[in-house]
Interface confidence: low
């Protein structure tokens, strides 16, 4: 019940691919560090051919000192990577207790109570996804595939789609065959989901001196896990902004964690030999080597940790949830051994939490994070992670308390600020959220350069009438989160024509437009009949898009699926539409009636994807008072006429008439999407 779409997460660090080889690797890090020239001509390896990472340098090698220049470079790279990604987490869901109950854990099944769209985390579902799609960012750090993507959609709230109920798994670029593909149930709310930062998940680890496990001296460790960064177009590597500052560099370069206890130092040669196999990607051999060490030295924390890492690598290689569950268990075993070095304990539990999140076991992950915070009470980064853990299960109250605690101790913690601001905004404390979001983003701290924060800061400013909103959208655009200041959708295919308003001729869908305009009265009458006889079919917009007023929708198609129940209410309209696959097959859109009553204002908002265009057919339009702005042009509806706009651009609606306004919304695929893309892009 708890699978991960591995697809989503393999070999996709395009955002940091500085040398053009199709993935992020040590060479890219060197380029970003200025240790190597950026390649301009090497063609990117098609993702299908890219080697899956085997977590180079995951954690720190057993050897304590860098042996040569290469090692020193790697150490610098770790620092850089640390800047790039603040060890973060994923989404999903779990109930497994730490020392869990002995009954049948709900854990994995738990997510089966959720409707979110991720497909088995390791086992992928859609084998033909378009490779150029990018998500402009609702991804942040680390790991998951899961609903990461979805989140944005809701977060960005599929604006005009109050009832959009299925999330999306975006751009799966690598596709691996799997035996058991099971659909993972997930939900589709607007939500937190730590960005899928795809990639290198660098973990801040505090390494207390061995004799005093409480004081934490910061250490960084790189945990590499590969996720799709959706090749965002021109995303400036997050690092370049920060590492030029010598102070920053100093701050990041930290001592290596101590991973060996006294006993493990006596078997260091054996540990090194096994670790070398793992580093070289000989995972099966490494697994056997570490298993043998665990058998020989059952009390060795480092051997047990090596076994966990190998299982973790093997899970990634085989795209197996089952193997990953074993790794999660082994990371837990490390923590239960006697005399575990504090650094190793922290690394092991952090990775356990991370992998639990990857599998969607949010609850189990939360318990692991709670334990980490108890063990290392002075480590702010762990508290920040714990806050995210609470957010991921929807427990805003506890998350808020955690961030309040962090900010009371470290008032300038940018990570805590953006998340605290995020929570305030979710609680509709719009004005209060602004300074936290703003100062948090301005801090430049790891984990703060996330499209969601720019999105919500701009949105909050717009809602309080602060014109500075567009400055933040501009910055979000510059940093690669939005396609432009106006076009702020996050599920995007690169290179599609982008303009707010379209003519029927430009879309190529002239037959559909003619059919809608010829049959507008039939469509109108069926909509009015539903309003009269089955008003309950019109569902209110529930995504906090309205400043005020009353706005409901009655959906006939959603995600390319016909709603049979709804079509009973508008049978002729449904029959009419069946002839037009550009709309009925548009899995990133809906077909629906939209009724808006007088006194309604819909805040400026943005749709989730640039893959669709939205047609509005006027059905009942009051003489004056109704208007729609898309980008910087405002239009009005006419009865029997179609307006076409790209709702990935900011749009806003006013209804100040004296009677209701009824329109018919028909989403169509963006005309430049190929048939193959239309087939393979995941639904929204």
């Amino acid at each position: 019940f708890d699978l991960v779409d591995y697809e989503e997460v393999l070999g996709k660090l395009g955002i940091y691919d500085a040398d053009g080889d199709g993935d992020f690797d040590v060479d890219d890090a060197k380029v970003l560090l200025g240790l190597k020239e950026r390649s301009t001509s090497e063609p990117a390896v098609p993702p299908e051919e890219a080697e899956p990472h085997t977590e180079p340098e995951e954690q720190v090698p057993v050897e304590a000192e860098p042996q040569n220049i290469e090692d020193e470079a790697k150490e610098q790279i770790q620092s850089l990577l640390h800047e790039m990604v603040h060890a973060e987490h994923v989404e999903g869901e779990d109930l497994q207790q730490e020392d869990g109950p002995t009954g049948e854990p709900q854990q994995e099944d738990d997510e089966f109570l959720m409707a979110t769209d991720v497909d088995d985390r390791f086992e992928t579902l859609e084998p033909e996804v378009s490779h150029e799609e990018t998500e402009h960012s609702y991804h942040v750090e680390e790991t998951v595939s899961q609903d990461c993507n979805q989140d944005m959609e809701e977060m960005m709230s599929e604006q005009e789609n109050p009832d959009s109920s299925e999330p999306v798994v975006e751009d799966e670029r690598l596709h691996h065959d799997t035996d058991d593909v099971t659909y993972q149930v997930y939900e589709e709310q607007a939500v937190y989901e730590p960005l899928e930062n795809e990639g290198i998940e660098i973990t801040e680890v505090t390494a207390p001196p061995e004799d005093n496990p409480v004081e934490d001296s910061q250490v960084i460790v790189e945990e590499v896990s590969i996720f799709p960064v959706e090749e965002q177009q021109e995303v400036p590597p997050e690092t370049n902004r920060k590492t030029d500052d010598p102070e920053q560099k100093a701050k990041v370069k930290k001592k290596k964690p101590k991973l060996l206890n006294k006993f493990d130092k006596t078997i260091k040669a054996e540990l090194d030999a096994a670790e070398k196999l793992r580093k070289r990607g000989k995972i099966e051999e490494a697994v056997n080597a570490f298993k043998e060490l665990v058998r020989k030295y059952p009390q060795s924390p480092r051997a047990r940790y090596g076994k966990a890492q190998c299982e973790d690598d093997l899970a990634e290689k085989r795209r197996s949830n089952e193997v990953l569950r074993g790794a999660i268990e082994t990371y837990q075993e490390v923590a239960s051994l006697p005399d575990v070095p504090a650094d190793l304990l922290k690394l092991s539990l952090k990775r356990r939490s991370d992998r639990q999140q990857f599998l969607g076991h949010m609850r189990g992950s939360l318990l692991t994070l709670q334990r980490l915070v108890q063990l290392f009470p002075n480590d702010t980064s762990l508290k920040n992670d714990l806050g995210v853990g609470y957010l991921l299960i929807g427990d805003n109250d506890n998350a808020k308390k955690v961030y309040e605690e962090v900010l009371s101790v470290t008032p300038n913690d940018g990570f805590a600020k953006v998340h605290y601001g995020f929570i305030l905004k979710a609680q509709n404390k719009i004005a209060e959220s602004i300074p936290y979001l703003k100062e948090g983003i301005e801090s430049g701290d790891p984990g703060t350069d996330d499209g969601r924060f720019y999105f919500h800061l701009g949105d909050a400013m717009q809602r309080v009438g602060n014109k500075e909103a567009y400055k933040w959208y501009e910055l979000g655009h510059k940093r690669g989160h939005f396609a432009s200041v106006w076009q702020r959708s996050l599920y995007n295919v690169n290179g599609l024509k982008a303009q707010p308003w379209w003519t029927p001729k430009e879309t190529g869908y002239t037959e559909l437009v003619k059919s809608l305009e010829r049959n507008w009265k039939l469509i109108r009458d069926e909509g009015l009949a539903v309003m009269d006889k089955a008003k309950g079919l019109f569902l209110p917009e529930d995504e906090n898009l309205r400043e005020k007023g009353d706005w409901s929708q009655f959906t006939l198609w959603q995600q390319g699926r016909r709603n049979e129940n709804a079509c009973k209410g508008a049978p002729k309209t449904c029959t009419l539409l069946e002839k037009f696959p550009e709309t009925t097959g548009c899995r990133r859109g809906q077909i629906k009636y939209s009724i808006m009553h007088p006194g309604t204002h819909v805040w400026p908002h943005t749709g989730p994807t640039n893959c669709r265009l939205r047609m509005h057919l006027g059905l009942v339009i009051p003489k004056e008072g109704c208007k729609i702005r898309c980008a910087n042009e405002t239009k009005t509806w006419e009865e029997g006429k179609v307006l076409i706009f790209d709702d990935s651009f900011e749009h806003e609606v006013w209804q100040d008439a004296s009677s209701f306004r009824l329109i018919f919304i028909v989403d169509v695929w963006h005309p430049e999407l190929t048939p193959q893309q239309r087939r393979s892009l995941p639904a929204i």
């Epitope: 020392d99 109950p101 009954g103 049948e104 409707a115 939900e187 991921l392 805003n396 979710a426």
Partner: antibody, heavy 127, light 107 residues
Framework: QVQLVESEGGVVQPGRPLRLSCAAS????????MHWVRQAPGKGLEWVAV????????RYAGSVKGRFTISRDNSKNTLYLQMNSLRPEDTGVYYC????????????????????WGQGTTVTVSS | GIVLTQSPATLSLPPRERVTLSCGTS??????LAWYQQKPGRAPRVLTY???NKAAGTPARFSGSGSETDFTPAISSLEPEDFAVYYC????????AFSPGTKVDIK
């Protein structure tokens, strides 16, 4: 408004089957997992079964496993409970209940409380 | 499966009194515990989920606390409409289970 309405239950002889249905309206039925819960006369609540939002997985209480089947038809916004080999101890009021979902912006996560319940339908198993 | 216990089975109290209920679980359920209220002849309704999070429409006088195996919801001041049966429910492990219930009636 959000509503769940169970079909008429009825009196049925031991060993015979009965199918209950639960019609949902006023919300996006296909986005919610759904439960059946029952209550024997004068007794407490007993969880019976749950089904995922898309019908792809289900779970049952030990007392009904192998005899009851939960299913759903999202195109009809309807939840079903097929009860076979009924026993006198299956007598009671049967409720369908929706799994509530988060409305915050941070987590695509369903809360697992049963946030909307039907009015209940009585099933009597007696010879 | 996990067994839930509740005590007492019946509680007789006057209006405006503070009431504390208790629910115990045979194993650690972390915070995966919800409280429901049921009035005679009516369907139950959720009051709190995940121990302390109030469901929509739950009055402020209701609160929940506890973790792992011991949980204590409270009503700060009983109103006439609060006289009902209260159940706790765990969703940590399958099968999900309800407690036997505590009936709160008017003294």
């Amino acid at each position: 408004q959000v509503q769940l309405v169970e079909s008429e239950g009825g009196v049925v002889q031991p060993g015979r089957p009965l199918r209950l249905s639960c019609a949902a309206s006023g919300f996006a039925f296909s986005s919610h997992a759904m439960h059946w819960v029952r209550q024997a006369p004068g007794k407490g609540l007993e969880w019976v079964a749950v089904i995922s939002h898309d019908g792809s997985r289900d779970r049952y209480a030990g007392s009904v496993k192998g005899r009851f089947t939960i299913s759903r038809d999202n195109s009809k916004n309807t939840l079903y409970l097929q009860m076979n080999s009924l026993r006198p101890e299956d007598t009671g009021v049967y409720y369908c209940a929706r799994v509530g979902r988060s409305s915050n912006w941070f987590s695509r996560y369903y809360y697992y409380d049963m946030d909307v319940w039907g009015q209940g339908t009585t099933v009597t198993v007696s010879s | 499966g996990i067994v839930l216990t509740q005590s007492p089975a019946t509680l007789s109290l006057p209006p405006r009194e503070r009431v504390t209920l208790s629910c115990g679980t045979s194993q650690n359920v972390s915070h995966h515990l919800a409280w429901y209220q049921q009035k005679p002849g009516r369907a139950p309704r959720v009051l709190t989920y995940d121990v302390a999070n109030k469901a929509a429409g739950t009055p402020a006088r209701f609160s929940g606390s506890g973790s792992e195996t011991d949980f204590t919801p409270a009503i700060s001041s009983l109103e006439p409409e609060d006289f009902a049966v209260y159940y706790c429910q765990q969703r940590s492990n399958w099968p999900q289970a309800f407690s036997p219930g505590t009936k709160v009636d008017i003294k």
